[in-house]
Structures are given as C-alpha cells and as structure tokens.
C-alpha cells in the first residue's frame, strides 16, 4: 500500500495520502456526475468491512466501457493485495442486492472518508 496510490507523483506515498487521493477521485466522480453514472449500470452491493477494497474492485471491475470510474478501478487495485478480474466474487458481496454505480460510489465515499478521519488506512 505504501508504494501505491500516487498516480500524480512518482515514488512511494504514505497510506493516508493514497486513501486521500482515492477519496478525492470519488468526490470528483460524484460532483461531476451529469447523466446517470456508467449509464445506470448495476453492481453488487458490498459489506463495508475488512477486505472491502478488493470487494469494491470486484464489483466495479464488472462495469465495462465507463471511463468515469477507470481511475477509481486502478486506484482500488493499489489497495487490494491480489489480482482481481471480472466475474470474481468475494464473500463480502451482498449477492442478492444490486445497486446503481452512483449509489455504490456514494456509499463507498462516505465510508472511506470516515476511515480517513479515524486513521484507518489499511
């Protein structure tokens, strides 16, 4: 984690900086949203607990052709210790609940901001 997340600047970045950058990207997405995000695509809801970065990536990676979340997908991969590919599902998915990408991003953003405030970066 300490080596990832810094897309704007080269070299290692602290985990807190990586998380701040991810939050800022999610803020950009929510603020710049005009038409429905990713054409209203639906993704699996996730439990916002330990391991949620991989779970979030597993959900979002199944959305293709949506440039608005490509940077988020890349950033999330920096928080997930294993390689994630489309069709992969973790136990953290709420498999009977699908939500719009816009709502997924909003829920994730809220949770990440609280993690940042509480100093939980891993």
């Amino acid at each position: 984690l300490t080596c990832l997340g810094g897309f704007a600047s080269p070299g290692p970045v602290p985990p807190s900086t990586a998380l701040r950058e991810l939050i800022e990207e999610l803020v950009n997405i929510t603020q710049n949203q005009k038409a429905p995000l990713c054409n209203g695509s639906m993704v699996w809801s996730i439990n916002l607990t330990a391991g949620m970065y991989c779970a979030a990536l597993e959900s979002l990676i199944n959305v293709s052709g949506c440039s608005a979340i490509e940077k988020t997908q890349r950033m999330l991969s920096g928080f997930c210790p294993h390689k994630v590919s489309a069709g992969q599902f973790s136990s953290l998915h709420v498999r009977d609940t699908k939500i719009e990408v816009a709502q997924f991003v909003k829920d994730l953003l809220l949770h990440l901001k609280k993690l940042f405030r509480e100093g939980q970066f891993n």
């Epitope: 807190s16 701040r20 916002l48 901001k113 609280k114 405030r117 970066f121």
Partner: antibody, heavy 120, light 112 residues
Amino acid sequence: EVQLVESGGGLVQPGGSLRLSCTGSGFNIKDTYIHWVRQAPGKGLEWIGRIDPANDNIKYDPKFQGRFTISADNAKNSLYLQMNSLRAEDTAVYYCARSEENWYDFFDYWGQGTLVTVSS
Amino acid sequence: DIQMTQSPSSLSASVGDRVTITCRSSQSIVHSNGNTYLEWYQQKPGKAPKLLIYKVSNRFSGVPSRFSGSGSGTDFTLTISSLQPEDFATYYCFQGSHIPYTFGGGTKVEIK
C-alpha cells in the same frame, strides 16, 4: 436547514437515570458523526463521546464509559444519551453537535442544549 | 488523555485592542492522517459554542477576518486583531485528533 434539537433534560435525583434525545433535521445522521458535549454551570466544555450512526461505532471519554451510553435510531434521525447513576457533578447543559459532512474536520452545528439538574 | 491548557483564563481588553489567546497541548495533536485537528470555538452566555477556526488556521465560513489561528506541534494561538463589541465572550480551543477529544479550559474576554 440543518438543525439539532435536544430534549429530555430536567431534574433527577442522585443515583437516578435520564435519557436525552437529539433529533437532526435537514441532513441524514448516517452521513456524519454526532457528539455529546456538556457544560457544568460556570464551567468549561467537556467532550463526552461520539457515535457514527452508520455503523454504531461509538467512542467515549473513559471518565464517562460505563455510566453513559450513546446510541442512534437512524429511522428517526435521532441520537440518545442514556445517563445512569447520576451524581450532583453531572448537573450541566448537555449539547449534541455534528461533525461537518465533507471531511469531518469540526463541529459545524450544535443543538441549543438541554439542562440536567441532579439534586435531591 | 491529551490536556489542552489555555492561557490566560481571563483577560480585560478594550474595543480595538489586539488580543492573543494561547493553547498548549500535552502532546502532539497531529493525527495519523497528517491533519492537525485544532479548533477554536466562541461561546456567549446561554448559547451553544460557535466555530471560529479549524485545522489550526482555517477560518470558518462567515467568520470575520480579524480572527486568525496559528501554531504547530503543541503550541497554538488565536488572535483577534481588533477587538469588537460582539467579541466579548469565552473562547475554547479543542483537539479532535486523538480520542478522547478534549477542550481547553476557556478564556473569558471581558470589557476593560
């Protein structure tokens, strides 16, 4: 318009219990943290604790842990402070306050306060 | 727990005076996320506190420019550059970096 309104204060005997309420309007309590702060007559401000209503993550000042319990009812957009084994020194105005919603950097809205008097 | 020590506990000043209030924390209040959650609140009798300054030096929306905050590490200052009649009140510093969060004891600014 964002508002916090406390209620439930009043006169209680030493050893008694009281539950204070704080109801939010104009925002969703799950989107932020809510704190309880008190102020004894003529004294300074004291932070009691806070709750994240999204997940019931609660933190207290250790001096209040055990006697005071913070909880939330998201459906009612309300917070509670349950106070047990009350003592004369718990006499104070009790405020709820919310952390601002962007980065939770500070308390941007406070309730008007509710007075609790512990006396026989 | 982190103690926040404010000084002076009270002061008398006249309209137009420059007023400085200091707040010292018993240990560093730099949060693990890099921020320093040091705030200043103003309180008038019978009213809830109002935010003036957050994260050491950021003026809250609507707060007059005569209020400024500075400091780092463990030493922080609130300055009122030219005291106005509506500024007579009690001022509290507050650290929101480490739980339990703590307030300073307050500084009462009175009319000379």
